[in-house]
Interface confidence: medium
């Protein structure tokens, strides 16, 4: 069966200065492939974290993801700003040989709403 | 405080259209996700659609695919359901539910309209 | 489709009795879950979400516990108000959002 995303919550609000957790999980790991955050849709979306290792300023893994069979990808953002508002995807990716990684599923999206402190 | 009026319902027959209306108070509509949910007579609730407070995303059930379609006019506070091909198994109380604003539970109900459908 | 069953479908007790129902989901709902209230001829009425939260206005009688899969309604001392039909929803997964088919509370 295809791998399902899910974010369940539709929006968060959080102050400017605090953190937030954007809840993220996966029905599979298969097919294999990383899972990435990312800001906005279509052309101006941002990538915001990637389970790949990289280093994201601000933005840590809330889960260990190391562990076999774990299936929580979700973030947590801390002092946010607010640049930070916007709409955010959880995706799956399915990792390609020569070409690039094909997205495959995303969550629902969650909405964050930075208030002022 | 919030309410939720429902009105359309009625009596009509297999094959025949109906359009449900909700008037929604005394909150700010165009902030929030709204739902139909129905019941038939003497069995539980089951989820019909959802739209979502700009009226950009909508979902339907598949019992309902292709035959009812939800809508929204946030200048007048008033969700829509427009019913066409209605059988049998239509019949039921519609309710119309307001989600909460980050979740998707339904914090306020209006009290329901009656859609019989019968030759 | 995550499919949530409710158990006992009738629960038959007396006024002061404590009620406990019980809702199970086919897959994981972590404590995305709700439980309503409904009595004849009205509108079902929030009671609990998140799995143990109560909404505004609800008697601390009323108590959710559970995660996961498994999850628990107690009414610690029915009042006669409180007979009526209790439904368990999901709201994890993505639409179609999913109800319980009900358990039916009823005076012995």
């Known amino acids: 069966t295809e791998v399902k995303v899910t974010q369940p919550e539709k929006s968060v609000s959080v102050a400017a200065g605090d953190s937030t957790i954007l809840n993220c999980t996966v029905t599979s790991l298969l097919p294999v492939g990383p899972i990435r955050w990312y800001r906005g849709v279509g052309q101006s979306r941002l990538l915001i974290y990637s389970f790949t290792g990289e280093h994201f300023p601000r933005i840590r893994n809330v889960s260990d993801t190391t562990k076999r069979n774990n299936m929580d990808f979700s973030i947590r953002i801390s002092n946010v700003t607010p640049e930070d508002a916007g709409t955010y995807y959880c995706v799956k990716f399915q990792r390609g040989s020569s070409e690039p990684d094909t997205e495959i599923q995303s969550g629902g999206g969650t909405e964050v709403y930075v208030l002022a402190k | 405080e919030v309410q939720l009026v429902e009105s359309g319902g009625g009596v009509v027959q297999p094959g025949r259209s109906l359009r449900l209306s909700c008037a929604a108070s005394?909150?700010?509509?165009?902030?929030?996700?709204v739902n139909w949910v129905r019941q038939a007579p003497g069995k539980g609730l089951e989820w019909v659609s959802l739209?979502?407070?700009?009226?950009?995303?909508?979902y339907y059930a598949d019992s309902v695919k292709g035959r009812f379609t939800i809508s929204r006019d946030n200048s007048k506070n008033t969700l829509y359901l427009q019913m066409n091909s209605l059988r049998a198994e239509d019949t039921a109380v519609y309710y119309c539910?307001?989600?909460?604003?980050?979740?998707?539970?339904?914090?306020?109900w209006g009290q329901g309209t009656l859609v019989t459908v019968s030759s | 489709e995550i499919v949530l069953t409710q158990s006992p479908g009738t629960l038959s007790l007396s006024p002061g009795e404590r009620a406990t129902l019980t809702c199970r989901a086919s897959?994981?709902?972590?404590?995305?879950l709700a439980w309503y209230q409904q009595k004849p001829g009205q509108a079902p009425r929030l009671l609990i979400y998140?799995?143990?939260s109560r909404a505004t206005g609800i008697p601390d009688r009323f108590s959710g516990s559970g995660s996961g899969t498994e999850f628990t309604l107690t009414i610690s001392s029915l009042q006669s108000e409180d007979f009526a039909v209790y439904y368990c929803?999901?709201?994890?997964?993505?639409?179609?959002?999913?109800f319980g088919g009900g358990t039916k509370v009823e005076i012995k």
């Open positions: 539910a307001k989600e909460n604003n980050r979740y998707r539970f339904f914090d306020d």
């Open positions: 005394g909150f700010t509509f165009s902030s929030y996700d």
């Open positions: 739209i979502s407070g700009s009226g950009e995303i909508i």
């Open positions: 897959q994981s709902v972590y404590t995305y």
């Open positions: 998140g799995a143990s």
């Open positions: 929803q999901q709201y994890y997964d993505r639409p179609p959002l999913t």
